[in-house]
Amino acid sequence: QEGKFSGPLKPMTFSIYEGQEPSQIIFQFKANPPAVTFELTGETDNIFVIEREGLLYYNRALDRETRSTHNLQVAALDANGIIVEGPVPITIKVKDINDNRPTFLQSKYEGSVRQNSRPGKPFLYVNATDLDDPATPNGQLYYQIVIQLPMINNVMYFQINNKTGAISLTREGSQELNPAKNPSYNLVISVKDMGGQSENSFSDTTSVDIIVTENIWKAPKPVEMVENSTDPHPIKITQVRWNDPGAQYSLVDKEKLPRFPFSIDQEGDIYVTQPLDREEKDAYVFYAVAKDEYGKPLSYPLEIHVKVKDINDNPPTCPSPVTVFEVQENERLGNSIGTLTAHDRDEENTANSFLNYRIVEQTPKLPMDGLFLIQTYAGMLQLAKQSLKKQDTPQYNLTIEVSDKDFKTLCFVQINVIDINDQIPIFEKSDYGNLTLAEDTNIGSTILTIQATDADEPFTGSSKILYHIIKGDSEGRLGVDTDPHTNTGYVIIKKPLDFETAAVSNIVFKAENPEPLVFGVKYNASSFAKFTLIVTDVNEAPQFSQHVFQAKVSEDVAIGTKVGNVTAKDPEGLDISYSLRGDTRGWLKIDHVTGEIFSVAPLDREAGSPYRVQVVATEVGGSSLSSVSEFHLILMDVNDNPPRLAKDYTGLFFCHPLSAPGSLIFEATDDDQHLFRGPHFTFSLGSGSLQNDWEVSKINGTHARLSTRHTEFEEREYVVLIRINDGGRPPLEGIVSLPVTFCSCVEGSCFRPAGHQTGIPTVGM
C-alpha cells in the first residue's frame, strides 16, 4: 500500500535486523515525470540494489559489526540519466542481535592496592569487549567477582563495578586488609553480555592477582589554634607520615599568602611558626607533600586544615570621626534620623563582636536634654521629644558609647536641623535633545550633563538633588551621578549599549530630594526632563539564547547519545562555530555547526551531577568574536551501586555469657539516588551456616535487626555476613560483614587485661 512500502522520493530511515536473509523489499519509490528511473549511491556494499522502477531491496544478510549504518543516496533521473530529483539520504540502520561473545582483553591481570585505600576507589580495571551494540543488552557487559581467594570469615574485601569493570575495596576491605596477615589475593572475574540478566547470555572469565601494600599516608584531623598565642614558637600542631622512610616533606600554600606561618620538618611534624591573627585570616588550608629524592611526588598531597579561634582583642570602631545626620524642622516624633553603624573586627555573630549603643551626652541640652534616643542593638537614632527649631538650635552633637563585652568606644554624631523641604527641583531644560553613540562606548563614560536647581536651604537634604531615570531604560544601561556641590548630574554608561535591542531610547529623568517634601507640595513637570539616545551598530560577539543551558540524561546512556544542545545567534547574522571548554572528564563533544552535544564516554552520576562545562560560540569569519555560556548536564541515576553498611560497625559486643537472646540494629545505604520513598533494601544472612546462630529481620527500607537465636556463644569475635539487596533494576546485592564480640564485661564494658588494648569494642548491646 502507499505509505509504508511505497511512496515518493524523500529522506527515509529503515531499520533491519542483522543476520536475517532478505524476505521482503525495503521500499518502492514512485517516479514523477520527467523522472523515469532511479540511481542508488553511497555505502551499498553491493548488498543494496535499486531497480529501474524504484524498487529498493537488499540481496544478502547484513552484519552490524561490519557496518552499523548504511548511508545511501537515491536520486530520480530523467531518461537522459540527469538527476531531476534528489539525491535524498536513505539511512539503513542495522539492528543488533547477540551474535558476539564478550572477551577479556587479558587472560590475567595484576595489580596492587594500599591498605586503607578509600572504599569504592578503583585501583585496577578489567576490560572486556563485545562487538555487539552497547546501546542494546547484546553489548551491555556485566562484570562479577566469581571467587575471592583467600576468603577470610566469608568477607568480601574486593568489589567490582558491574558496568565498568573497576575493581575497588569494599568497606571491609578498606578496614581489614593487612599485608602482614595476607599480602596477596586472587580474584576470578566473569563478564556476561545481556547485562547479565539472561540465561542466553555469553560469558568469559579472567584471573586477577592483587598485592596488598601498607598505607599510613593520611590527612590529619583539622587543627584549632587560638589567635595571639604567647607560647614560644614554633609549636607542633599536627603530623603526617609517608609509608616509607626517606621521603622529603614540604608544605604547599595553595593561597599564595604573603606570610605563611607554618613549617614541616623531615620527620613530617607540622609547626605553626608565629602567633596567628584571626582578624587577618581566620582559617588556613594548605597541603603536605611527600616527594622522592628526585623531587617527584610520591602520592596525592594531604589537605591540612587550621582554624584560628577568636579572642576578644578588638574594640568597636566608629564609621567616621563624626557622623552627620539631618533632620527637618517639622519632623515628627519617632522619625528615624539615621543609623550609626559601628564595626568590630572580632568574629561575627559571637559575643566578641556583639555591640550595644548608648547616648552618653547631648549638646546643647536645649530646649531640653533627651531629645534623641538610640536603639540599643540596632544603632538607629530617633527623635524622642518635640519638633526642633532651627533658629533656636541649628545643630546638636551627640556622644554615643559603643561597647562589646570587654571594650568601650565613644562615637560622635552631628545632627543638623534644616529647613522644611517646600521647594521642588527644577530642570534648566526640559529636553536635552538627541545624542548618537556607538554601541561599544566604554562603560563609565559620561555622555551627558544635566542640571536642575532647588531653592531650599543649600547643602541640605532639602536642596540636594538625586537624578533618576524613570523611563526609556528598563535594562538599566545608564546611571546618573550627582555632584554634591553643584547638583550637576552626569549621565554615565553603566551597562553595555545594544544597537540590536535598543537602537533608539527616549529617556526621562526625574529630579528628587533625599528629604521628603512637606505635606501639600508635590513634584511636577518642572522636575522632569528628557533626551533621546541613538545607538549605532558595532560588530558584536554572538549571544547565547540562555546564560545556562540545562539537560537531563540517564547516567548509563550509550556513547554517542545526544545529551543536549545550545543555540547562539550573532547580532550581525554571521554563522557560528561551537566548541566546549572545561570538559575536565572528557565526557562530551559538540557539533560545531549545530550546537548539539553528544556523550563520548561513559557518564557517572556518582562522580558528580550536574556536570558543568562551558560552551563557546565563535563568529565564523568577521572578527571571530566569541562568547561563553554554561551547559549543565543533570545525570539521572541508574542502579549501579551495590548496598553497603551506612557506617562503621566495628566495636559491637554482647556481655558473655549471654543471659538472654540479644539483638542489635544496623543501617544500610548505597550511593544511588533514592527519590521520594527512599531505599527499599531486603536483608538476609550471607550464608546458610549462620542460620543456627543468627536471625535477620527487616525493620524498614534501610534498617534491620540482627538477633541471636540462642545464648550459647563462645567468648570471641563472630563475623556475621549479611546479604543486602537493593531491589533495583537491575537488582544489585552487597555482602557486608558485622563483627560482633562476646566478651567479659566490667560495669557494662568489655574487660581486656592490660596489653590487649587494640580493637576494644565500644558499643554494648
Epitope: 515525470p33 520527467p34 523515469v36 528511473t37 529501474r52 530523467d78 531518461a79 537522459n80 540519466g81 540527469i82
Partner: antibody, heavy 123, light 107 residues
Framework: QVQLQQSDAELVKPGASVKISCKVS????????IHWMKQRPEQGLEWIGY????????KYNEKFKGKATLTADKSSSTAYMQLNSLTSEDSAVYFC????????????????WGQGTTLTVSS | DIVMTQSQKFMSTTVGDRVSITCKAS??????VVWYQQRPGQSPKLLIY???NRYTGVPDRFTGSGSGTDFTLTITNIQSEDLADYFC?????????FGGGTKLEIK
C-alpha cells in the same frame, strides 16, 4: 549496427508546416532518448529538445516551445519533429541524435547522429 | 541558459603539430561536457566525454581536460583528416547548449 536515417531535404513556403522523420535501427528504440538539433550555416548547434519513446516523455528548449513538436511511433521505431509557422529563420540543417545513456550506464553523450535534413523556407 | 564560449573561431595549424581548443562555460557545469568533431558536409561525431574520456575508436592523439568552467580539447600530431569543426556541449543543466565551434584549418 546502430543507424539513424533522416528524411530527405524539404523546400517549403513561409507559414507552412513540415514534419521531419528519423528512423532508427540496430538497437531497442524505447531504451534511449532521441534529441533534435538545429544547425545554420557557419553557426553552432542548438539543442531543440528530446523525446523518450518508452513513455512519450518530451522536454523542449524554451526557445523552441510552440515551434517544434516531438513525437515517436514505437511500432516503426521512428521519431518525428514537426515545425510549424515556418519563416526564413527556420532554414537550417536539422539533426536527430541518440543519447547514449540507458538504465545503469554512464554513457552521457550523443553517440549516434542522423545524416541531417536540410530545410529551406522560401517563397 | 549556460553559454559555452569557444573564443577561437578558426585555428590554423600544420600536419604533425599540436593544438589546444578551449571552451569556457558561463557557470559551473562540473564534468558534464562532451566534445564532437564535424567534418565538412557530415554529421557530428563523438570524440571525448566527461570531459577526459576518449570514445571507442577515437585515436589517442585526442585528449580532453578540465572541470567546472574551463575545458580543453588537445590534438597532438595533427593529421590532414583532422580538418573539421570542433564543438563542446554541456549537459549539466537544461537547455543543453553547444559552443559556437572552432574550425581547424591545415596549412
Amino acid at each position: 549496427q546502430v543507424q539513424l536515417q533522416q528524411s530527405d531535404a524539404e523546400l517549403v513556403k513561409p507559414g507552412a508546416s513540415v514534419k521531419i522523420s528519423c528512423k532508427v535501427s540496430g538497437y531497442t528504440f524505447t531504451d534511449h532518448t532521441i534529441h533534435w538539433m538545429k544547425q545554420r550555416p557557419e553557426q553552432g548547434l542548438e539543442w531543440i529538445g528530446y523525446i523518450y519513446p518508452r513513455d512519450a516523455i518530451t522536454k523542449y528548449n524554451e526557445k523552441f516551445k510552440g515551434k517544434a513538436t516531438l513525437t515517436a511511433d514505437k511500432s516503426s521505431s521512428t521519431a518525428y519533429m514537426q515545425l510549424n509557422s515556418l519563416t526564413s529563420e527556420d532554414s537550417a540543417v536539422y539533426f536527430c541524435a541518440r543519447w547514449g545513456y540507458y538504465f545503469g550506464s554512464t554513457s552521457y553523450y550523443f553517440d549516434f547522429w542522423g545524416q541531417g535534413t536540410t530545410l529551406t523556407v522560401s517563397s | 541558459d549556460i553559454v559555452m564560449t569557444q573564443s577561437q573561431k578558426f585555428m590554423s595549424t600544420t600536419v604533425g603539430d599540436r593544438v589546444s581548443i578551449t571552451c569556457k562555460a558561463s557557470q559551473n557545469v562540473g564534468t558534464g561536457v562532451v566534445w564532437y568533431q564535424q567534418r565538412p558536409g557530415q554529421s557530428p561525431k563523438l570524440l571525448i566525454y566527461s570531459p577526459s574520456n576518449r570514445y571507442t575508436g577515437v585515436p589517442d592523439r585526442f585528449t580532453g581536460s578540465g572541470s567546472g568552467t574551463d575545458f580543453t580539447l588537445t590534438i597532438t600530431n595533427i593529421q590532414s583528416e583532422d580538418l573539421a569543426d570542433y564543438f563542446c556541449q554541456q549537459y549539466s543543466t537544461y537547455p543543453w547548449t553547444f559552443g559556437g565551434g572552432t574550425k581547424l584549418e591545415i596549412k
